[in-house]
């Protein structure tokens, strides 16, 4: 069993639950955003291809004191397999463009909504 | 306690659209999954789909095209629509609570009969 | 989409009898099952989730058990508000999808 999820699940979940879980706290950090998110930081954009979520945590984790996406880097630790920590990056960022973090938690929601729907939970 | 009540129609015509509404007390939709599920005479249980804490919504691919599920937050109720419904939409229709981070439904309304029928 | 197959469609027991219904995923669902009960005009109601996990306030003459595929509930003595019919349900991937339902009846 999987703990997906990471510190953010209660315990081991299937894929689909913790893909919903994370959806909706995307979902969340959208439907909330008042003043620019983390402050305006910027982030490496990725390709939304297998092995999204390490990538997505790569970008991510090099952002600090930002709480608003604290629980989504918890969640995406849960789909990764490998530790990931600041300052480390895979092939699978596009590593010439930069967007606002904002832009970011769109693109990824809006490209996990489609799997979702799909069936491709794992 | 959380309870569910569902309420509509007993008789839709066929091509029209069917609409019910499920009221939430003891709870608040603003938190969990609320989700339909229907029951066919003589077929399996059917999941829907649902709407979240957050307004979210999924659906059965094989309803996508017939269903909308939406929420009034305000009366704390959800409802369900599905449109050009045909005898093969008769049914029981339940809706039912799933928490997050679970994939089970722990709390269930007694249901609706709905007759597609001219 | 997951098929689930519940066995068998119906049984006769008496109060007192070991009761055992099956479920069968069309492929594999790690323990995520769930069973549900439902008498006659009334609501379903959650028995057992994860297999083998006893709902809240439901009587320990319940039993869950299984992983994959295959699943078994088991009512140990059958009492005489246990006359209902069960539903297997799985939570792998959406959308979630019920076995047939298992109606035990009085003999």
């Known amino acids: 069993l999987t703990c997906l999820g990471g510190f953010a699940s209660p315990g081991p979940v299937p894929p689909s639950t913790a893909l919903r879980e994370l959806i909706e706290e995307l979902v969340n950090i959208t439907q909330n955003q008042k003043a620019p998110l983390c402050n305006g930081s910027m982030v490496w954009s990725i390709n939304l291809t297998a092995g999204m979520y390490c990538a997505a945590l790569e970008s991510l984790i090099n952002v600090s004191g930002c709480s608003a996406i604290e629980k989504t880097q918890r969640m995406l630790s849960g789909f990764c397999p490998h530790k990931v920590s600041a300052g480390q990056f895979s092939s699978l960022h596009v590593r010439d463009t930069k967007i606002e973090v904002a832009q970011f938690v769109k693109d990824l929601l809006l490209h996990l909504k489609k799997l979702f729907r799909e069936g491709q939970f794992n | 306690e959380v309870q569910l009540q569902e309420s509509g129609p007993g008789l839709v015509k066929p091509s029209e659209t069917l609409s019910l509404t499920c009221t939430v007390s003891?709870?608040?939709?603003?938190?969990?999954?609320w989700n339909w599920i229907r029951k066919p005479p003589g077929k399996k249980l059917e999941y829907m789909g649902y709407?979240?804490?957050?307004?979210?919504?999924y659906y059965n691919p094989s309803l996508k095209s017939q269903i909308t599920i939406s929420r009034d937050t305000s009366k704390n109720q959800l409802s369900l629509k599905l449109s050009s419904v045909t005898a093969a939409d008769t049914a029981v229709y339940y809706c039912a609570r799933l928490a997050k981070w679970t994939w089970y439904f722990d709390i269930w309304g007694q249901g609706t009969t709905v007759t597609v029928s001219s | 989409d997951i098929q689930m197959n519940q066995s068998p469609s119906s049984l006769s027991a008496s109060v007192g009898d070991r009761v055992t219904i099956t479920c069968h995923a069309s492929?594999?669902?790690?323990?995520?099952l769930s069973w549900y009960q439902q008498k006659p005009g009334k609501l379903p109601k959650l028995l057992i989730y994860k297999a083998s996990d006893l709902h809240t306030g439901v009587p320990s003459r319940f039993s869950g058990s299984g992983s994959g595929t295959d699943f078994t509930l088991t009512i140990s003595s059958l009492q005489p508000e246990d006359f209902a019919t069960y539903y297997c349900?799985?939570?792998?991937?959406?959308?979630?999808?019920f076995g047939g339902g298992t109606k035990v009846e009085i003999k």
């Open positions: 349900q799985q939570g792998q991937s959406y959308p979630y999808t």
């Open positions: 003891g709870g608040s939709i603003t938190s969990d999954y």
């Open positions: 492929q594999n669902i790690n323990v995520w």
């Open positions: 709407i979240s804490y957050n307004g979210n919504t």
